[in-house]
Interface confidence: low
């Protein structure tokens, strides 16, 4: 069995190896061969060559999808905690304390009030703004908060929104809100959040956290 | 191995200033939040002052705030320690302290040190 096996490699071989011959004595013009002939065999040899070729570039997509996967794709994620401040500026200050999570060097915290990533995608993006008010002690209008995004060369732009009417407690009564939602960012993209009255804001222990996710 | 090279501490007068340095190596140094932590003659250990990975925010002592500055350089890999005017009872050698923690922090736990460095404050 493994004999005929054998012979038929061998075959195979021999017919190959007549194959080129026949092209090479086409590329140099032998009479003994029609024109006909040769084009025949010449389209037949390029269909061969672009059989392998393609087969080459599936092979290379294949080999830079399992990098993407491994090396290419690390994790980035962020998780920053409030931070108190004295700046009268609406922009939420955070800090990398208490329970904080900053991945890798893909992700970072910037002047204390932004999250800017280095890598283009789609992330999953997230708030969580706790604030004490007063309805007589504040104005008319409500807390808001605001999820801002600034992309290079682009204005800054508003993502995601959120008000609350303030409390009838006194001294104050807590609030909470929460915001998220799934954005694509490009490479060096920052993130940040905006309030309507940064004093009210409660920075206790778990209360006001801001963060991102690499889907 | 990590490694936790302190330098810089000397004799000063009061009011004086001295700028400690701190070596580090054998880790990654941007990923871990950094403190000094300093030891008076006969006391225990006092935490002076800490410092994020980014830079970002800095904590300090009631007993240093507005006089120390901790500050740090990634590049280098360096810590520093700019204290200015200095009283007799900031006497103490001065170490630096790695964080034990990375990504998650709990704060003043450390699982590396320096040699420290002895400061004297004295006329």
């Known amino acids: 069995h493994r004999r005929l096996d054998k012979i038929e490699d061998e075959r195979n071989l021999h017919e190959d190896f007549v194959f080129m011959k026949t092209i090479q004595r086409c590329n140099t013009g032998e009479r003994s061969l029609s024109l006909l002939n040769c084009e025949e065999i010449k389209s037949q040899f390029e269909g061969f060559v672009k059989d392998i070729m393609l087969n080459k570039e599936e092979t290379k997509k294949e080999n830079s999808f399992e990098m993407q996967k491994g090396d290419q794709n690390p994790q980035i994620a962020a998780h920053v905690i409030s931070e108190a401040s004295s700046k009268t500026t609406s922009v939420l200050q955070w800090a990398e304390k208490g329970y904080y999570t900053m991945s890798n060097n893909l992700v970072t915290l910037e002047n204390g009030k932004q999250l800017t990533v280095k890598r283009q995608g789609l992330y999953y993006i997230y708030a969580q703004v706790t604030f004490c008010s007063n309805r007589e002690a504040s104005s008319q209008a409500p807390f808001i908060a605001s999820l801002c995004l600034k992309s290079p060369g682009r204005f800054e732009r508003i993502l995601l929104r959120a008000a609350n009417t303030h409390s009838s407690a006194k001294p104050c009564g807590q609030q909470s809100i929460h915001l998220g939602g799934v954005f694509e960012l490009q490479p060096g993209a920052s993130v940040f959040v905006n309030v309507t009255d940064p004093s009210q804001v409660s920075h206790g222990t778990g209360f006001t956290s801001f963060g991102l996710l690499k889907l | 191995e990590v490694q936790l090279l302190e330098s810089g501490g000397g004799l000063v007068q009061p009011g004086g200033s001295l700028r400690l340095s701190c070596a580090a190596s054998g880790f990654t140094f941007e990923l871990y939040r950094m403190s000094w932590v300093r030891q008076a003659p006969g006391k225990g250990l006092e935490w002076v002052s800490e410092i994020s990975g980014s830079g970002f925010p800095t904590y300090y002592a009631d007993s240093v705030k507005g006089r120390f500055t901790i500050s740090r350089d990634n590049s280098k890999n360096t810590l520093y320690l700019q204290m200015n005017s200095l009283r007799a009872e900031d006497t103490a050698v001065y170490y630096c302290?790695?964080?034990?923690?990375?990504?998650?922090?709990?704060?003043?736990?450390?699982?590396?040190w320096g040699q420290g460095t002895l400061v004297t404050v004295s006329s």
């Open positions: 302290a790695k964080s034990l923690h990375d990504k998650t922090q709990h704060h003043q736990e450390f699982d590396y």
